[in-house]
């Protein structure tokens, strides 16, 4: 059975990509680089420059061992662009022998008018332009090629699609004299798929479209369109699936209503309503038909779009998602939480749990957090004793077996995993919370007290003493 991974303290960064020497493979010629050693003493800088140049030219050959790097490819079709008109692109790490392809959509909020897009361009240009993208990225979590970090998908072909359209992957409008920015999220996905077909995707068995945060919502908005695109291009045998992480939002009532001034304070329904018009946003056809013209914003909300999707989708969502709380104007500042807010937060968890009731493939831990699948410690969190990679593996199996007309859940291999305990961090495997101001890790007891929970009140309904409850939470039972 699955070994419990204790190998990276929660919240820590993954190790840098290894820089290891690798001998040339058998039969490969060893290239030689001429170095001019004359008058080295007189011109050390020039000599060092040559050595540096040599090292840089050798690096791509040497970093073959545990190299986690995905390499940047800007789109050949340069008319499919980021917000500022620079070409969009993707990072790719191919895996010989695998017919599984993982396409990951990056997240990073959105902007929905000229003012907040200008501000975003000033402060977060990487999310609007490809001009400063690095040549490589390290694959972590579900994008890792290390079996210990990514137990079930390590051998897949990995594709990371950077988010540079600021439109929740929904836009279909190009930059023009009238439009200061292009919003081409939906078109970027289509173009990446088209280019990947020439790089081996044509032989795929399974394409998993995954994403976190705005990328997770992007999965819900695009998964059926990708399946349709592949069918039209003559690849109906490729099974398209979705994995939406932290993109299942509620259009609930904000804790405190504020006017729609900027991305963070604007109620999500209003932000999306404005965004769709600004981006020329497109939503899944079957969902669009369910709502009147001008009401397409509804399709950005998981519980409304999900029932209309044809492709299988696995939903991963923290019950107390930090981005959801942010748009609901809940800001945990370090001051103890008042009862009204505590009840609001608990109710949010209850509502979210309710929306996942009919989602057969779901993983929803009772934690206060945001995003999980490309975190290095994504294997740590468990719901009812099952980790997320294990649940995804069970989902794989259930989809494989459903072709054999078996509709019953696999024994000992659950895919519907939603925490039922009612308060944040009642699940002992939740990522460690840090005090926003001191940076100190908080244990469960400190966190719950900070959240304004009286330990007596929490323990009583479970027939426990507060000390017993704290012991259980600390030990992970």
């Amino acid at each position: 059975s699955e070994g419990r991974k204790t190998w990276r303290r929660r919240g820590q960064q993954p190790p840098p990509p290894p820089r290891t020497e690798a001998a040339p493979a058998a039969g490969q010629p060893v290239e030689s680089f001429p170095l001019d050693f004359t008058a080295v003493e007189g011109n050390m800088d020039s000599f060092m420059a040559q050595v540096k140049s040599l090292a840089q030219s050798l690096y791509p050959c040497s970093a073959q061992q545990l190299n986690e790097d995905l390499r940047l490819h800007l789109l050949l079709n340069t008319s499919v662009t980021c917000n500022d008109g620079s070409p969009a692109g993707y990072y790719l790490k191919e895996s010989r022998g695998s017919r599984r392809w993982l396409l990951f959509l990056e997240g990073g909020w959105y902007c929905f008018n000229r003012e907040n897009c200008d501000s975003r361009y000033d402060t977060m240009r990487r999310l609007m332009s490809s001009r400063d993208w690095p040549r490589t990225r390290t694959g972590t979590g579900i994008l890792s090629s290390q079996p210990e970090e990514n137990p079930y998908w390590w051998n897949a072909n990995m594709v990371f699609i950077p988010y540079c359209s600021s439109d929740v992957w929904s836009g279909a409008s190009s930059k023009s004299e009238k439009n200061e920015y292009a919003f081409m999220g939906a078109l970027i996905i289509q173009e990446v798929v088209r280019e990947l077909l020439g790089r081996g995707l044509s032989g795929a068995k399974v394409l998993l479209l995954a994403g976190s945060s705005a990328g997770g919502t992007g999965v819900l908005l695009n998964v059926d369109r990708v399946a349709e695109q592949l069918e039209k291009l003559g690849y109906p045998a490729i099974q398209v699936r979705g994995l939406a992480d932290s993109g299942w939002f509620l259009d609930n009532k904000q804790y405190r209503h504020t006017d729609c001034v900027d991305t963070i304070t604007c109620a999500p329904t209003e932000a999306i309503r404005r965004g769709i018009r600004y981006w020329n946003g497109v939503v899944p056809e079957r969902c669009r038909r369910q709502f009147q013209e001008g009401e397409e914003w509804n399709c950005f909300f998981g519980y409304k779009v999900y029932p209309t999707l044809r492709c299988p989708v696995f939903v991963v969502q923290w019950l107390f998602d930090e981005a959801q709380l942010t748009v609901d104007n809940v800001h945990l500042t370090g001051q103890p939480v008042q009862e009204g807010l505590r009840l609001y937060i608990q109710n949010l968890g209850r509502e979210l749990r309710h929306t996942l009731k009919d989602v057969p493939a779901s993983f929803a831990p009772a934690c206060l957090s945001h995003e999980i699948i490309i975190r290095s410690h994504w294997t740590d969190v468990q719901v009812k004793g099952t980790s997320l990679p294990r649940a995804l593996h069970c989902w794989d199996r259930s989809l494989h077996d459903s072709h054999k007309a078996s509709k019953t859940p696999l024994k000992g291999c659950p895919v519907h995993l939603v925490d039922s305990c009612p308060w944040p961090h009642c699940n002992p495997s939740c990522p460690t919370v840090r005090d926003q101001f001191t940076g100190q890790e908080m244990n469960v007891a400190q966190f719950l007290m900070h959240m304004g929970f009286d330990m007596q009140t929490v323990a009583q309904p479970q027939g426990l003493e507060p000390s017993e409850l704290l012991g259980m939470l600390s030990n992970g039972s």
């Epitope: 545990l66 079996p147 137990p151 593996h393």
Partner: antibody
Amino acid sequence: EVQLQQSGPELVKPGASVKMSCKASGYTFTDYYMHWVKQSHGKSLEWIGYIYPNNGGNGYNQKFKGRATLTVDKSSSTAYMELRSLTSEDSAVYYCARRGATGFFDYWGQGTTLTVSS
Amino acid sequence: DIQMTQSPDSLSASVGETVTITCRASENIYSTLAWYQQTPGESPQLLVYTGTNLADNIPSRFSGSGSGTQYSLKIKSLQPEDFGSYYCQHFYGTVTFGAGTKLELK
């Protein structure tokens, strides 16, 4: 040249513990996961667990969890496996193996023979 | 856990012959499979990884094939140094080895 040099044979009594070593050379020790594998006499191979020398992260086969402990000493590029509460069933050859870029074990130690007998 | 069923348990062959060893997984392992050779008194040696890729410095008479749950290792034109035990191994969640196949000289 990559080499994994394991410690010599061990003869121990039932109930005791043993700690064997695997010294790595010829590559950057912290960049590769190290796995341990058991082979009983005339039998197949059985995976015990792994350790990542970079940060000490590990994972175990449930069967060995709690009885096997994997550690490393980065300064000497050495991986260790301690086995506790030994019985005759633990008599076997134990290998350390480096997990390379292929996702599989590209270099193996020569093995440490453990005999548990009273 | 995923089980790996290797067959045959043993086989006899002569130098120059071709032999095939198979490995069946209890469920789809998506080519996350390797083959190792172990000669008496030696450590195992990686032959083939991710189902079909030949490891460095392994002669081309060895080849791997298969996908899904069924995989095989073929050795063409057997050489004296090829006799020994062969193991399949997968790395998909945890690591599991097949029971092994003993290849003996006829």
